[in-house]
């Protein structure tokens, strides 16, 4: 099956202090390689979450990525702050035999818009 990375929401709004879920699904787990979430693009992009076991404060996976045939790579960001605003991308990599993993596909991005916490 052809690989497609889908981020169904163009944007989400969240009040500061709340949590939000950023959805991402894949149509195939092949080729073998990790899925990572970034905020921003190009040189200035920031790694937000990697489904490879590291710990990321305030960011957790929504479903069990270790389960066989799991295609859901959505994440939850807790205690959102205004600094979390930006566009988030779910990116699929192909594992290289020795060289670094190759970025092969990305979702269309989901903008996180942070609203002031209601007083």
């Amino acid at each position: 099956k052809e690989l497609k990375v889908t981020q169904p929401e163009k944007s989400v709004s969240v009040a500061a202090g709340d949590s939000t879920v950023l959805n991402c699904t894949l149509t195939s787990l092949l080729p073998v390689g990790p899925i990572k979430w970034y905020r921003g693009v190009g040189q200035s992009r920031l790694l937000i979450y990697s489904f490879t076991g590291e710990h990321f404060p305030r960011v957790t996976n929504v479903s069990d990525a270790t389960k066989r045939n799991n295609m859901d790579f959505s994440i939850r960001i807790s205690n959102v702050t205004p600094e979390d605003a930006g566009t988030y991308y779910c990116v699929k990599f192909q594992k290289g035999p020795s060289e670094p993993d190759t970025e092969i596909q990305s979702g269309g991005g989901t903008e996180v818009y942070v609203l002031a916490k209601p007083s």
Epitope: V41, S106, Y113
Partner: antibody, heavy 118, light 108 residues
């Protein structure tokens, strides 16, 4: 789908103008809407975006702090309040309806001309 | 911000000829790219989205290709109504949404 812009005209630098875009033929509140402009002899420039609910708003740096986008879903109308106008704001302003999945534009109005001149 | 550069600025061709327009992105936008046609006094019209998918009602003489940083809009056989200005737009890196500077296709 029909988008009809109005409110353009000739103003002096520093003055204000309010553009409107009357929408019909689709469920207005379900779509994010944008303003895009084109200066004489120039290309297209994105100006501002507002989500269907009106909760999410973005502006181009060139208009931030001077322009305000809004919408009235009960009237199926999009607005652009333009304050502190400058000569470089002179352009045809288009109202554009976004695709429901991605940020490209399925439908456009004919535009309304704004001229800022002393 | 992703910068889009269109070339050539002007393309002078005869009806029936093939037109090839190029749009280059300063960084990868994958296939998140659209093409529009603009004629004087008319609303801009969406031609292509997703780099290669034709919008509703667009004739099959229009085709799009490319991914990453280089994209092409091809008009296989120019008709009189195709002489216009064409713009590419990326919707991956945002905000802001950015357009190319345009390519004018004019009659020889």
């Amino acid at each position: 789908v029909q988008l009809v812009e109005s409110g353009g005209g000739v103003v002096r630098p520093g003055e204000s103008l309010r553009l409107s875009c009357a929408a019909s033929g689709f469920t207005f509140s379900s779509y994010d809407m944008n303003w895009v402009r084109q200066a004489p002899g120039e290309g297209l420039e994105w100006v501002s975006l507002i989500s269907g609910s009106g909760e999410i708003i973005y502006y181009a740096d060139s208009v931030k702090g001077r322009f305000t986008i809004s919408r009235d879903n009960s009237k199926n109308t999009l607005y652009l309040q333009m304050n502190s106008l400058r000569a470089e704001d002179t352009a045809v302003y288009y109202c554009a309806k976004e695709n429901n999945r991605y940020r490209f534009f399925d439908d456009w109005g004919l535009g309304t001309l704004v001229t800022v001149s002393s | 911000e992703t910068v889009l550069t269109q070339s050539p600025g002007t393309l002078t061709l005869s009806p029936g000829e093939r037109a090839t327009l190029t749009c280059r992105a300063s960084q990868s936008v994958y296939t998140y790219l659209a093409w529009y046609q603009e004629k004087p006094g008319q609303a801009p019209r969406l031609l292509i989205y997703g780099a290669s998918s034709r919008a509703t009602g667009i004739p099959d003489r229009f085709s799009g290709s490319g991914s990453g940083t280089v994209f092409t809009l091809t008009i296989s056989s120019l008709q009189s109504e195709d002489f216009a200005v064409y713009y590419c737009q990326q919707y991956y890196d945002r905000p802001p949404l950015t357009f190319g500077g345009g390519t004018k296709v004019e009659i020889k």
